[in-house]
């Protein structure tokens, strides 16, 4: 909680860089037709570019990306008993970021 | 890019804990009536609970929260000239997290 004498520090910009985010492993990434199963783990950490840039015409974008396959468990429920299978999900990690100009509408010449 | 011999490592759960997130300082947080100004910085870092829990009945929730006032610049544009003012925004940081049972819908009595 706030003390009554808390001083407001100057706000520091959240610079454009990679940060750890949580990626939800949706069941539909594993099997689109069957809903009678669980995925473990339900979420994983990924590295993603975030933060803001000096003005609205530039955005924090990844300049280097790595695809990372991970193995998850697909737990099918058959006659109330779990059957464990393996499935692979490809995650996307951002390795480097940059404030890049947004593809703006070009003037008609 | 993926090498052809890349092995799929077992996926590790993104545990329920605080992570650094980016919070956008909306102009409406500073002044709801006037839109003729800019805010600097446009975004800051906050600590927030994220990650997933063992089952769908529990969610990653903050158990301890701290309010943190920060000082931002409100840059008003008057007759095409910038006028710098100060404003305070109160940020919310999560200090601790826990997998807590989701309040289920209570039966109507």
């Amino acid at each position: 909680s706030l003390g009554s004498l808390t001083v407001a520090e100057p706000a520091m910009i959240a610079e454009c860089k990679t940060r750890t985010e949580v990626f939800e492993i949706s069941r539909r990434l594993i099997d689109r037709t069957n809903a009678n199963f669980l995925v473990w783990p339900p979420c994983v950490e990924v590295q993603r570019c975030s933060g803001c840039c000096n003005n609205r015409n530039v955005q924090c974008r990844p300049t280097q990306v790595q695809l990372r396959p991970v193995q998850v468990r697909k737990i099918e429920i058959v006659r109330k008993k779990p059957i464990f299978k393996k499935a692979t999900v490809t995650l996307e990690d951002h390795l480097a970021c940059k404030c890049e100009t947004v593809a703006a509408a070009r003037p008609v010449t | 890019s993926l090498g052809s011999l890349t092995v799929a490592e077992p996926a590790m759960i993104a545990e329920c804990k605080t992570r650094t997130e980016v919070f956008e300082i909306s102009r409406r947080l500073i002044d709801r009536t006037n839109a003729n100004f800019l805010v600097w910085p446009p975004c800051v870092e906050v600590q927030r609970c994220s990650g997933c829990c063992n089952n769908r009945n529990v969610q990653c929730r903050p158990t301890q929260v701290q309010l943190r006032p920060v000082q931002v610049r409100k840059i008003e544009i008057v007759r095409k000239k910038p006028i710098f003012k100060k404003a305070t925004v109160t940020l919310e940081d999560h200090l601790a997290c826990k997998c807590e049972t989701v309040a289920a819908a209570r039966p109507v009595t």
Epitope: E24, I25, S26, V65, E92 | -
Partner: antibody
Framework: EVQLVESGGGLVQPGGSLRLSCAAS????????MTWVRQAPGKGLEWVAS????????HYPDSVKDRFTVSRDNAKNSLYLQLNSLRAEDTAVYYC?????????????WGQGTLVTVSS | DIQMTQSPSSLSASVGDRVTITCRAS??????LNWYQQKPGKAPKLLIY???SLQSGVPSRFSGSGSGTDFTLTISSLQPEDFATYYC?????????FGGGTKVEIK
């Protein structure tokens, strides 16, 4: 329920620009690749662009490369397509579609489409 | 680029008929083949993915088969709501490409 709603279409002159948007709801948008597909009046379907779940990977056919740019804002559950240097042959209904865990998936859910007309 | 050739481009059939549409890829695409149905003024709808897997909610009268370069979409007993245009699409390599479509009309 999965919903994809496109907007931003309209009449534009040759050489002009337009920005299409697709608002997504009912699924974990940030977990899925997204795609734009177009259909010229009375013609078949043509793939236009795809973008990875995190926005770091994009793919285009040669017909639109260097003119169209796909992007996304996962915080806003939104997909975008910036159309520059438009030509008469770009006239079409533009659909956004959810395309699974990678580019080599199918197009599972589609929006209703937004019409782009390029004419002087 | 992989070319997808559908045949026939159009066909007339009656309710209850068995309808077969074929799709040929210009090179082998394994089972990376999807089928869509489109009705006038509507968005396409996924019917079959991975050559033979029935999309959730799609009636079992629709089936897909094939591998490599030759693929088939079969409607075992045509229903009134099945009159539409059908497209195949390969997702084996970019650029992703569609067949020209097959329009199924009422005889």
């Amino acid at each position: 329920e999965v919903q994809l709603v496109e907007s931003g279409g309209g009449l534009v002159q040759p050489g002009g620009s337009l920005r299409l948007s697709c608002a997504a709801s009912g699924f974990t948008f940030s977990s899925f690749w997204m795609t734009w597909v177009r259909q010229a009046p009375g013609k078949g379907l043509e793939w236009v662009a795809s973008i990875s779940a995190g926005g770091g990977i994009t793919h285009y056919p040669d017909s639109v490369k260097d003119r169209f740019t796909v992007s996304r804002d996962n915080a806003k559950n939104s997909l975008y397509l910036q159309l520059n240097s438009l030509r008469a042959e770009d006239t079409a209904v533009y659909y956004c579609a959810e395309s699974g865990g990678d580019i080599y998936s199918d197009f599972d859910y589609w929006g209703q489409g937004t019409l782009v007309t390029v004419s002087s | 680029d992989i070319q997808m050739t559908q045949s026939p481009s159009s066909l007339s059939a009656s309710v209850g008929d068995r309808v077969t549409i074929t799709c040929r890829a210009s090179q082998s695409i394994s089972n990376y083949l999807n089928w869509y149905q489109q009705k006038p003024g509507k968005a396409p709808k996924l019917l079959i993915y991975a050559a033979s897997s029935l999309q959730s909610g799609v009636p079992s009268r629709f089936s897909g088969s094939g591998s490599g370069t030759d693929f088939t979409l079969t409607i075992s007993s045509l229903q009134p709501e099945d009159f539409a245009t059908y497209y195949c699409q390969q997702s084996y390599s970019t650029p992703l490409t569609f067949g020209g479509g097959t329009k199924v009309e009422i005889k």
